[in-house]
């Protein structure tokens, strides 16, 4: 189901990444320098910014982030 409208619930933040709010609804996600070999799987649809620098991601499949607008 969809997550309830709330100002007190933390939106999904991928494990080990750092997240902070970007306005009322959106989330900035920093997954840099984590040794990742693939994209984090549980990205919030409310992600406005994603930093994947300094990782080991060698290739991306077509449409790698279908949940993001």
């Amino acid at each position: 189901g969809s997550s309830p409208r709330s100002g007190v619930l933390l939106r999904g933040c991928p494990t080990h990444c750092h997240c902070e709010p970007d306005g009322r609804m959106l989330l900035r996600v920093d997954c840099s320098d984590l040794g990742l070999s693939e994209l984090p799987s549980n990205l919030s649809v409310f992600t406005s910014y994603l930093d994947l620098s300094m990782n080991n991601i060698s290739q991306l499949l077509p449409n790698p982030l279908p949940s993001l607008r």
Epitope: S6, G7, V8, L9, L10, C13, H18, E20, R24, N42
Partner: antibody, heavy 117, light 107 residues
């Protein structure tokens, strides 16, 4: 700087109602939710509910439905919580706090409510 | 409702000590955990969000870790100003719930 001003104390008789206030300043009032939290003497923190000042949409802890009513006055950047049918169990410190996407980043100083005849 | 348990209600430590405060959730909260500090005068401050994100202005001696149901707050080098009560809070589901608090005292 961000400030949430709450009265220091309120003394109310059992059975009566009280309306606690929380005046916000230093930020855009309608851009952040307002949370209300209860703390009994020597106890932990208990979430009462929250309100979005932009349209007064609110969520309540089931435990406080019928006890607490949250409202806002955007013209004065003030959030209110009315507590009804007061008993000694309602004697506590009540905090307001602003939040955005889960970050409850600024808290008021709290209002000490005493329910006594 | 998700129950948050801080098994240690009070903790005595010496200045300069490394102190760890633990918090357990009754179910997986997916790292959606905040830590708050409440000073003796009642002032409440957010220290850490999302399990490990240090808030702006919070000293780097504070750190958060954990996953699933078990989380902890560590103060690496205890200072006088850290004497307070620390609460964990889950932000995974409504209603958000808090741990009972751990009161930190100087030995």
């Amino acid at each position: 700087q961000v400030q949430l001003q709450q009265p220091g104390a309120e003394l109310v008789k059992p059975g009566a109602s009280v309306k606690l206030s929380c005046k916000a300043s230093g930020y855009t009032f309608t851009s952040y939710w307002m949370q209300w939290v209860k703390q009994r003497p020597g106890q932990g923190l208990e979430w009462i509910g929250e309100i979005d000042p932009s349209d007064s949409y609110s969520n309540y802890n089931q435990k406080f439905k019928g006890k607490a009513t949250l409202t806002v006055d955007t013209s004065s950047s003030t959030a209110y919580m009315q507590l009804s049918s007061l008993t000694s169990e309602d004697s506590a410190v009540y905090y307001c706090a602003r939040s955005l996407s889960g970050y409850v980043d600024y808290w008021g100083q709290g209002t000490t409510l005493t329910v006594s005849s | 409702d998700i129950q948050m348990t801080q098994t240690t209600s009070s903790l005595s430590a010496s200045l300069g000590d490394r102190v760890t405060i633990s918090c357990r959730a009754s179910q997986d909260i997916s790292n959606r955990l905040n830590w708050y500090q409440q000073k003796p005068d009642g002032t409440v401050k957010l220290l850490i969000s999302y399990r490990s994100r240090l808030q702006s202005g919070v000293p780097s001696r504070f750190s958060g870790s954990g996953s699933g149901t078990d989380y902890s707050l560590t103060i690496s080098n205890l200072e006088e100003e850290d004497i307070a009560t620390y609460f964990c809070q889950q932000g995974n589901t409504l209603p958000p719930t808090f741990g009972g608090g751990t009161k930190l005292e100087v030995r």
